[in-house]
Interface confidence: medium
């Protein structure tokens, strides 16, 4: 039997030291932050990388990871000879298992794998494997890069010295040296059969906290065919607490992976906290922005002939994997909230990463259903205006779906934002459906073990006087063409309303596959083909917040953890340095710019040229080496939200007329100083409906689940 713990995300950690075997038993201990001092963090948003530094001071250090490795400036280190691997050629035992930590997918190694050489101070034992990936279609997902080139996936193997410590966790907690290997996965036409056990495992840990045993695999087969060409540098954990204790070995050559196999990574879910609401989202882009090298020197191995046979295109294509086939990451922080009895406000934030700037405008699409009839409307909103729209003449008995897409030059589009559902007059919470692999809910209720984790909990924010249901589902952050053959009428109305009796609220992050096929012409410019809806029966669900939980270990506190939110920006940037960086003059070499706003500042925009840097010890000048990806604040208002309603006094309640959209002028604070999301409840005068409910998760609530049992052999995901 699998024992699940579904944690409010602020109660779980995701850094490399977080997941380890309890030496006195077989349980995995997820340490609680109150006891350990580990703050909640995320890869984007208000808890994103630029904010890690405020609660994990080491994240602001100067020897941080990941980095971009410029081959021409890496010096050959004669001490970096052949790696000695021991045990890597053995098949893994059936006790090796995989876990979705919510921040990554980790493989807990139960066999003895040792590495020595490569300048490591001793013989190090492999503890675990973690993965980092992008969002779709082989987009950049690696943390490290070589000559500016990033890869779709990076696998990291973490090691500790068992002669010095009895466990990996002890080494971390005592701030002692650990080792890490970084292995890049690159897209190839064919499946890599060596990855099959991993891919199969991924399908068993789709949801946060899921665990599964892995079929036997050979760890050596997950490494590049040639191990002779590698880079070495001293850095840090790439997740909080960002301890600067890692001896990194970064392999030059990638491991092949097919698009089909990549999809298993893109299908992983996590839970995120947004303004007290727990939402289920795809776990994507789980990489830390790159950090500056500062006074460090990157070395390369001195293994004879190992550097002579690298693929020419690898060296000649500095950009490598395109950041995306779309012009930016999706608009984020989608919110739908009622302004009064007949109007809704949709708000969002600008994308965190813009691959092909600038954003010209945003397409806001919304559909609604009434009496099985389906309607849709799309309109544009200039990107330099406040990123919110008012939908007036809202019908209380219609179900509304909203999503936003950024539009760049040449009609290039971003990925779609998460899709928000809203309906007033709710009578019960939508929590009984199953989400199948395509993201289309089936009408049949799921068993309790397979309940989609979409209920946000049972506490009600009564102080607002505005009760509505906010229920969370998976994000539809697919490619910009991710329309589907399913229609809102057929899927949403019949499935959700008829099949489930869903009556209201906003469902955050509805799957994009539920969006209607008939998107307006303006909103369907992407040339990519829509993927067919495959109604598989594999549930991507995990128990809801009230799932089984084990007792807290040793009475460790499980309260909300440390979040030292001192930085102005709430949009964690992806591919730029935020907290470990200094200065803000330079662009990333790939031409990526970043829209997320940081603190008030009037620095010039980044320019391609960058100051020369002299490497310590080498005395050679390295032109433009240190990419500084520090967020440069903009005058855009994209980061701002929670403006006053700005209501139209002439709005008329109507259940017959389709809603109209109006742009809303923001009358708030300095546009250069984006505010954090306001937690302030709306006034009673703005309330939408007395019989709606706003389901939230109270951050102060305790989660008494301190341990998670390892999966029993009899029950595989």
């Amino acid at each position: 039997v699998l024992h699940y713990v579904v944690c409010f995300p602020a109660l779980t950690e995701g850094y490399v030291g977080a997941l380890h075997e309890n030496r006195h038993g077989s349980a995995v201990q997820i340490r609680r932050r109150k006891a350990s001092g580990d703050p909640y963090w995320a890869y984007s948003g208000a808890y994103g990388p630029e904010h890690w530094v405020t609660s994990s001071v080491s994240c602001g250090g100067r020897h941080q990871s990941p980095i971009d490795i410029l081959d021409q400036y890496a010096r050959v280190g004669e001490e970096y000879q052949e790696l000695q691997l021991d045990g890597f050629d053995n098949e893994s035992s059936n006790k090796t298992w995989m876990k979705n930590t919510g921040k990554t997918v980790a493989i807990l190694l139960k066999d003895d794998y040792f590495v020595s050489g490569a300048g490591l101070p001793g013989r190090f034992k492999a503890e675990k494997v973690e993965f980092h990936w992008g969002h779709s279609n082989g987009s950049a997902g690696s943390e490290h890069s070589i000559n500016g080139r990033r890869f779709p996936v990076e696998m990291q193997i973490f090691f500790y010295n068992p002669d010095d410590f009895d466990s990996f966790q002890t080494a971390i907690s005592e701030n002692r040296i650990i080792g890490a290997m970084a292995i890049f996965f690159q897209v190839s036409p064919r499946d890599n059969s060596a990855l099959d056990p991993i891919i199969h495992g991924l399908k068993g840990v789709v949801h946060h906290e899921k665990e599964t045993f892995l079929d036997p695999f050979v760890l050596r087969d997950l490494l590049p065919a040639s191990l002779g060409s590698y880079y070495r540098y001293t850095g840090s954990l790439t997740t909080p607490p960002c301890s600067e204790i890692v001896e990194w070995i970064v392999f030059r050559r990638p491991v092949p992976i097919s698009y089909h196999q990549l999809e298993a990574f893109y299908s992983i879910f996590t839970t995120e906290q947004q303004d007290h609401v727990k939402s289920v989202e795809y776990l994507r882009n789980n990489f830390r922005p790159q950090q500056r090298l500062h006074d460090r020197v990157v070395s390369k191995s001195a293994v004879r002939d190992s550097w002579n046979h690298d693929m020419t295109d690898f060296l000649e294509n500095p950009l490598g994997t395109e950041a995306s086939k779309v012009c930016s990451s999706p608009p984020i922080h989608m919110k739908v909230q009622p302004l009064n009895q007949t109007a809704l406000q949709v708000s969002w934030s600008q994308p965190e990463t813009i691959y092909h700037p600038p954003i010209m405008n945003y397409m806001i699409s919304y559909s609604w259903t009434k009496n099985e009839d389906e309607k849709e409307k799309t309109f544009t909103k200039d990107s330099d205006k406040d990123l919110k729209a008012t939908i007036s003449h809202v019908s209380p008995d219609s179900l509304y779906l909203f999503r936003v897409q950024a539009v760049c030059r040449n009609d290039m589009r971003s990925d779609f934002s998460q899709t928000m559902l809203f309906q007033a007059n709710t009578t019960r919470i939508f929590q009984g459906t199953r989400i199948v692999k395509t993201g289309v809910p089936t009408a049949s209720p799921a068993s309790s073990a397979d309940m989609a984790p979409i209920s946000s909990g049972s506490s009600t924010w009564t102080s607002s006087g505005i009760p509505f249901s906010f229920v969370s589902m998976a994000t539809g952050m697919g490619p910009s063409s991710s329309g589907s053959q399913a229609t809102v009428a057929s899927v949403v109305t019949s499935t959700l309303l008829a099949g489930l009796g869903f009556g209201g609220g906003g469902i955050s992050s509805f799957p994009s596959t539920v969006w209607p096929t008939r998107l307006p012409t303006a909103a369907s410019a992407s040339k990519q083909a829509a993927r067919p809806v495959l109604a598989t029966t594999e549930a991507l669900a995990s128990p809801g917040p009230d799932g089984d939980s084990s007792p807290t270990k040793d009475g460790e506190g499980t309260e909300e953890g440390e979040k030292d939110e001192k930085s102005e920006s709430e949009d964690g940037e992806r591919e730029h340095e935020e907290d470990g960086e200094k200065d803000s003059e330079k662009k990333e070499k790939s031409g990526v710019t970043h829209a997320a706003e940081e603190r008030n500042q009037t620095e010039p925009s980044p320019t391609p040229s960058s100051p020369n840097r002299t490497a310590e010890g080498g005395h050679q000048t390295i032109p433009g080496h240190e990419q500084d990806h520090t967020a440069v604040p903009t005058d855009q208002t994209g980061g701002r939200r929670d403006a006053g309603p700005g209501l139209d006094p002439d709005m008329v309640t109507s259940t017959q007329v389709p809603p109209t959209a109006t742009e809303e002028q923001y009358a708030g604070s300095d546009p250069k100083r984006p505010e954090m999301p306001s937690k302030k409840p709306m006034s009673r005068g703005d309330r939408f409906s007395e019989d709606s409910r706003f389901i939230t998760v109270n951050p102060a609530e305790k989660n008494t689940s301190g341990m998670i049992s390892r999966p029993a052999p009899g029950r595989m995901e």
């Epitope: 580990d38 709430e570 999301p677």
Partner: antibody, heavy 113, light 111 residues
Framework: QSLEESGGRLVTPGTPLTLTCTVS????????MSWVRQAPGKGLEWIGT?????YTYYASWAKGRFTVSKTSTTVDLKITSPTTEDTATYFC??????????WGPGTLVTISS | SFVLTQPASVQVNLGQTVSLTCTAD??????ASWYQQKPGQAPVLLIY???SRPSGVPDRFSGSSSGNTATLTISGAQAGDEADYYC?????????????FGGGTQLTVTG
């Protein structure tokens, strides 16, 4: 967005005193707040910080002498047993780790017998 | 404990350039911020993250960092720049977080 300290007054040594920083325009659940003091003619001295979740950090010299707490819109600094050395102007500040340009005007505390 | 050292006072002629320094062991691993404080007022942030300048701060103020020394440079000093200047940084990690101010430098603008 604004901060304002209050509660500063003249008290005798040993009499507990609580200062309050009232914030508006941003959420304390998303921001860390710090208390800094400045004795007359002296430099700035960090006392402690409370983060978005209510976790507290103190200067080594301040532990046990000061307590930082908060409500939804206020951050309090309790001087548990003031001495004359605690006479100072007390400031609250937001986002001090990387540098804060959100400071209150300060409130003067005088400890005298 | 972590100590930031600043010169107690510095003089500069009107219109000249002056550099205020702040040193500490391992400052190279920390970010420095700089504050200006005039009598009876709260500190005003001039520089954060070693080199970044908030909006509203004149570009006459610039920050730099080299090794274990952070420097605030004021070019074209004006009478209104006469004030106390404090450098600051954070030290430690996690629960042992400590924030430290330097002792301050009193800048006098002459002429």
């Amino acid at each position: 967005q604004s901060l304002e300290e209050s509660g500063g007054r003249l008290v005798t040594p040993g009499t507990p005193l609580t200062l309050t920083c009232t914030v508006s325009g941003f959420s304390l659940s998303s921001n860390a707040m710090s208390w800094v003091r400045q004795a007359p003619g002296k430099g700035l001295e960090w006392i402690g910080t409370i983060d978005g979740y209510g976790y507290t950090y103190y200067a080594s010299w301040a532990k046990g002498r000061f307590t930082v707490s908060k409500t939804s819109t206020t951050v309090d600094l309790k001087i548990t047993s003031p001495t004359t050395e605690d006479t100072a102007t007390y400031f609250c500040a937001r986002e001090i780790y990387l540098g804060s340009n959100f400071w209150g005007p300060g409130t003067l505390v005088t400890i005298s017998s | 404990s972590f100590v930031l050292t600043q010169p107690a006072s510095v003089q500069v002629n009107l219109g000249q350039t002056v550099s205020l320094t702040c040193t500490a062991d391992t400052l190279s691993r920390r970010y420095a911020s700089w504050y200006q404080q005039k009598p009876g007022q709260a500190p005003v942030l001039l520089i954060y993250r070693d080199t970044s300048r908030p909006s509203g701060v004149p570009d006459r103020f610039s920050g730099s960092s080299s090794g274990n020394t952070a420097t605030l440079t004021i070019s074209g000093a004006q009478a209104g720049d006469e004030a106390d200047y404090y450098c600051a940084t954070a030290d430690g990690s996690g629960s042992s977080y400590q924030f430290v101010f330097g002792g301050g430098t009193q800048l006098t603008v002459t002429g």
